[in-house]
Amino acid sequence: MCYGKCARCIGHSLVGLALLCIAANILLYFPNGETKYASENHLSRFVWFFSGIVGGGLLMLLPAFVFIGLEQDDCCGCCGHENCGKRCAMLSSVLAALIGIAGSGYCVIVAALGLAEGPLCLDSLGQWNYTFASTEGQYLLDTSTWSECTEPKHIVEWNVSLFSILLALGGIEFILCLIQVINGVLGGICGFCCSHQQQYDC
């Protein structure tokens, strides 16, 4: 098991996932590709929590770059032991992974709440309401009720799709950061197993 290579692998994956989270969150601001609802403040309250942009996005880039940096072979070592610096780095990556767990956890929780509450939409009474808030998420199973939202067009599909994507991406980020906690602890305790000659690609 090469802990450094594994960390780099996780790091690159997190960068991709973070960018996808940011994109998904940004799309939530433009239902049906329109800007008017953001300017009129007719968006779900959970869109304004920036869960994908901050939690699953920017906050995830910090551990991602830390993990990618672990694979570098320029650690000077300490106490006469070449791997000692890398061990310290691996252990410090656990701290970065915990930050990632917090960010992805935030993303997952907000996305789940956004899915459960449903979108803010112009309902069948001509009012801007959280039409499905009282259904406790049951609306997700009954698509026939989605027509209760008359505006924005396809807002239920839009919100369900994007919050589901954020939920999934945040979940994957959470698992990857959890893996890196284990990887970092093992790497820090066991030391680096990769010699200068070993080259593994993700």
Epitope: L122, S124, L125, G126, Q127, W128, S147, T150, E151, P152, K153
Partner: antibody, heavy 120, light 106 residues
Framework: QVQLVQSGAEVKKPGASVKVSCKAS????????VKWVRQAPGQDLEWMGW????????IYAADFKGRVTMTTDTSTSTAFMELRSLRSDDTAVYYC?????????????WGQGTLVTVSS | EIILTQSPATLSLSPGERATLSCRAN?????INWYQQKPGQAPRLLIY???NLASGIPARFGGSGSGRDFTLTISSLEPEDFAVYYC?????????FGGGTKVEIK
């Protein structure tokens, strides 16, 4: 000024269909909903449904579901209401009405009404 | 379905008198709107949101009430006020109107 102008009176046979138009002027058509109400001779006002003029999504009253179709043409700021399978008790004056979305959703501008007579 | 019952069905009064029209719902509602209709004409908005006077409506018209009981008051009847008055709710679908109160000259 703000107004809704409806199409002229119609006489139809039972089983036929009627399509009433409602042309809006003096305001931004897509900023308001249009609802349809009818009033049979000497009877109360009866709500048929409404249409979101921005998205074109209609909401129909249960009594008319399957028999009514509400549409809009935003290029001409016109709303349409088609009622199928006409019966003699569909004889009424049909009104289109503008309303603003929000807390009170009051109906401040009414069309002049279209008399639809269903008779064999 | 929320049913609105208006009373009285007919109110016979003279010009200058005070008119009090009642509208009762079979369950609690958040607000009510009032309309005036004259023969051969479309209804006209008088009061929205229970107590707010619509644009261009004289101050002699007033609305009040909450929950299930609502009232339209005309402080001093003018000759042009003799018409049919409807209350309307949209707290839930279907939107419903009351049966109307006809205010006629005594």
């Amino acid at each position: 000024q703000v107004q809704l102008v409806q199409s002229g009176a119609e006489v139809k046979k039972p089983g036929a269909s009627v399509k009433v138009s409602c042309k809006a002027s003096g305001y931004t058509f897509t900023n308001y909903g249009v609802k349809w109400v009818r009033q049979a001779p000497g009877q109360d006002l009866e709500w048929m449904g409404w249409i979101n003029t921005y998205t074109g999504n209609p909401i129909y009253a249960a009594d008319f579901k399957g028999r009514v179709t509400m549409t809009t043409d935003t290029s001409t700021s016109t709303a349409f209401m088609e009622l199928r399978s006409l019966r003699s008790d569909d004889t009424a004056v049909y009104y289109c009405v503008r309303f603003q979305y929000g807390d009170y959703r009051y109906f401040d501008v009414w069309g002049q009404g279209t008399l639809v007579t269903v008779s064999s | 379905e929320i049913i609105l019952t208006q009373s009285p069905a007919t109110l016979s009064l003279s010009p200058g008198e005070r008119a009090t029209l009642s509208c009762r719902a079979n369950s609690g509602i958040s607000f009510i709107n009032w309309y005036q209709q004259k023969p051969g004409q479309a209804p006209r908005l008088l009061i929205y949101g229970t107590a707010n006077l619509a644009s261009g409506i004289p101050a002699r018209f007033g609305g009040s009430g909450s929950g299930r009981d609502f009232t339209l008051t005309i402080s001093s009847l003018e000759p042009e006020d003799f018409a049919v008055y409807y209350c309307q709710q949209w707290s839930s679908n279907p939107l419903t109107f009351g049966g109307g109160t006809k205010v006629e000259i005594k």
